[in-house]
């Protein structure tokens, strides 16, 4: 009774299409497949950053993969073929492994990269990167800025450079359509004539760098002798209401602060009557039904309440 | 659809390099192994190299091992064989093809004639 | 080297009649063969992968069988458009290797 084998996968490789992180994994089926070609064979892939403690894992029936990676550190990946138990009367089939890596041949000294990349999604609307040069370097170092994302034919260039003593040091994007909730990838290389410049590679998915706009249309209503009801609005924009939360800063008479997290836009505070004067801010922040992550956005105008008699008062800012 | 384009004939001396390119359309093209087949005058198909489609692997059959090199630009979609030491047998029509996803060759461009002679 | 050999060299089919070209390789290449059609002063085209599976888009008179050793390319009913030079060729292993052909024409 012969012991079945299987050889592994042939010209496996990982092969960078330009998109500065997104990279293919493919092989060609293994030789002599014919004694199974009743059977779907399945390929286990296994593939990570080096440096990365875990393997991500696949099994698939197809001849690629496709995922992100960190184009800063190498990545190494390998794969074998597997023949189900149905295909062999018995237990699985492993080849031997087919391993390759990929890395980007790095130009220049890690200082002479750019320092302090900050990229920040302002009100879902507008994306906006800043950096510092590189340590070190000199003047006529300029840094270019080139992006990717899922929808994009191919990387482009930013058009619209911050720049600070004659050096590029933040990109204003253009709109970008459908590139939310998708890994958004960043490349900021370097030219001067002194030096080569080492190239940074960034990765972040656009949801999670939001900035929204303050809230507005802050209010105070009384709804018993002791309470009142603040009120506020949404930002204006494209955010809507279900992904905003917000944190308020009460100060009562200058002395009581009250801060709190809500989810809605109104907040129910229990006051005595000799509260003299109350003030109150609000900020915005995208939430975990939106985003994984986000930033809160600047305080609003302060509204505030003066005088005696509350319950005659709605104050519109 | 898928087009592979080549580049026009050569008339070259023996002793002399070419390097012939297959512009390719229509499809992803780092996805795809690419192979180059010649045909003398005459005669039948001959392969005579394969690159994978990142370009990692090459594959060569002795007639042409260390004269021919074929290469790969995926930026710009489009395959190379550089033809070096040229002798007269090395006369003939030269196809690039695609290289399917089970190894097959399924789409061939138009072909390139090189005549090698003095 | 794998070595494909195919008979007959030459093939004359009357329209409508079926025609059969034989490929037998000179060693184990499983399914891994393909068949192409080059009709005069055009390029190769694809009929034919692992040994039996049609490409889109190729009538379905054209069949394909065989593992292992032996290969049969089968057409149904030759039409004048059939006219031209068939090849075997296998790719399980490197260097891939063609057959000489087989020329069919209308008798």
């Known amino acids: 009774d012969t012991e079945i084998k299987v050889n592994p996968p042939q010209d496996f490789e990982i092969v960078d299409p330009g998109y500065l992180g997104y990279l293919y994994l493919q092989w060609q089926p293994p030789l002599s497949l014919d004694h199974f070609k009743e059977c779907t064979v399945e390929y286990e892939l296994k593939y990570r950053n080096i440096g990365s403690e875990t393997w991500k894992t696949i099994i698939t029936k197809n001849l690629h993969y496709k995922d992100g990676f960190d184009l800063n550190k190498g990545i190494e990946a390998k794969i074998h073929t597997l023949l189900p138990w149905q295909c062999t009367n018995g237990s699985e089939v492993q080849s031997s492994w087919a391993e390759t890596t990929y890395w980007i041949s790095p130009q220049g000294i890690p200082e002479t990269k750019v320092q302090d990349m900050d990229c920040v999604y302002y009100n879902w609307q507008y994306l906006l990167c800043s950096w510092k040069p590189g340590i070190g370097v000199l003047l006529d170092t300029n840094y270019n800025l080139f992006y990717w994302y899922e929808g994009l034919d191919h990387a482009l260039q930013c058009v619209d450079y911050i720049k600070a003593d004659g050096q590029n040091i933040g990109c204003r994007f253009p709109y970008l359509e459908a590139s939310d909730y998708k890994d958004f990838y960043i490349c900021v290389n370097g030219s001067s004539e002194n030096k080569p410049i080492r190239s940074s590679y960034f990765t972040f998915q656009l949801q999670n760098i939001v900035k929204p706009l303050p809230p507005v249309y802050l209010t105070f209503t009384r709804e018993s002798s002791c309470e009142i009801k603040l009120k506020w609005s949404i930002p204006l924009g494209p955010i809507p209401a279900r992904c905003f939360d917000y944190e308020i800063e009460i100060r009562e008479d200058d002395t009581t602060l009250v801060t709190a997290t809500v989810e809605n836009e109104t907040y129910t505070l229990k006051t005595t009557n000799e509260t003299r004067q109350l003030c109150f801010v609000v900020r915005s922040k995208v939430n975990i039904y939106c985003s994984d992550d986000g930033i809160w956005s600047e305080w609003s105008d302060k509204q505030c309440w003066e005088g005696e008699d509350l319950s005659k008062k709605t104050l519109l800012r | 659809q898928v087009q592979l384009v080549q580049s026009g004939a050569e008339v070259v001396k023996p002793g002399a390099s070419v390097k012939l390119s297959c512009k390719a359309s229509?499809?992803?093209?780092?996805?795809?192994?690419m192979s180059w087949v010649r045909q003398a005058p005459g005669q039948g198909l001959e392969w005579v190299a394969t690159i994978s489609g990142g370009g990692s692997y090459t594959y060569y059959p002795e007639s042409v091992k260390g004269r021919f090199t074929i290469t790969r630009d995926n930026s710009t979609s489009t395959l190379y064989m550089e033809m070096r030491s040229l002798r007269s047998d090395d006369t003939a029509v030269y196809y690039c093809?695609?290289?399917?996803?089970?190894?097959?060759?399924?789409?061939w461009g138009q072909g390139t004639l090189v005549t090698v002679s003095s | 080297d794998v070595v494909m050999t195919q008979s007959p060299l030459s093939l004359p089919v009357t329209l409508g009649q079926p025609a059969s070209i034989s490929c037998k390789a000179s060693?184990?290449?499983?399914?891994?063969v393909a068949w192409f059609q080059q009709r005069p002063g055009q390029s190769p085209r694809r009929l034919i992968y692992s040994a039996s599976y049609r490409y889109s888009g190729v009538p379905d008179r054209f069949s394909g069988s065989g593992s292992g050793t032996d290969f049969t390319l089968k057409i149904s009913r030759v039409e004048a458009e059939d006219v031209g030079v068939y090849y075997c060729q296998q790719y399980n292993a490197y260097p891939l290797t063609f057959g000489q052909g087989t020329k069919l024409e209308i008798k």
């Open positions: 229509g499809f992803t093209f780092s996805s795809y192994g």
């Open positions: 060693q184990n290449v499983d399914i891994n």
């Open positions: 093809a695609r290289r399917d996803l089970r190894s097959a060759m399924d789409y």
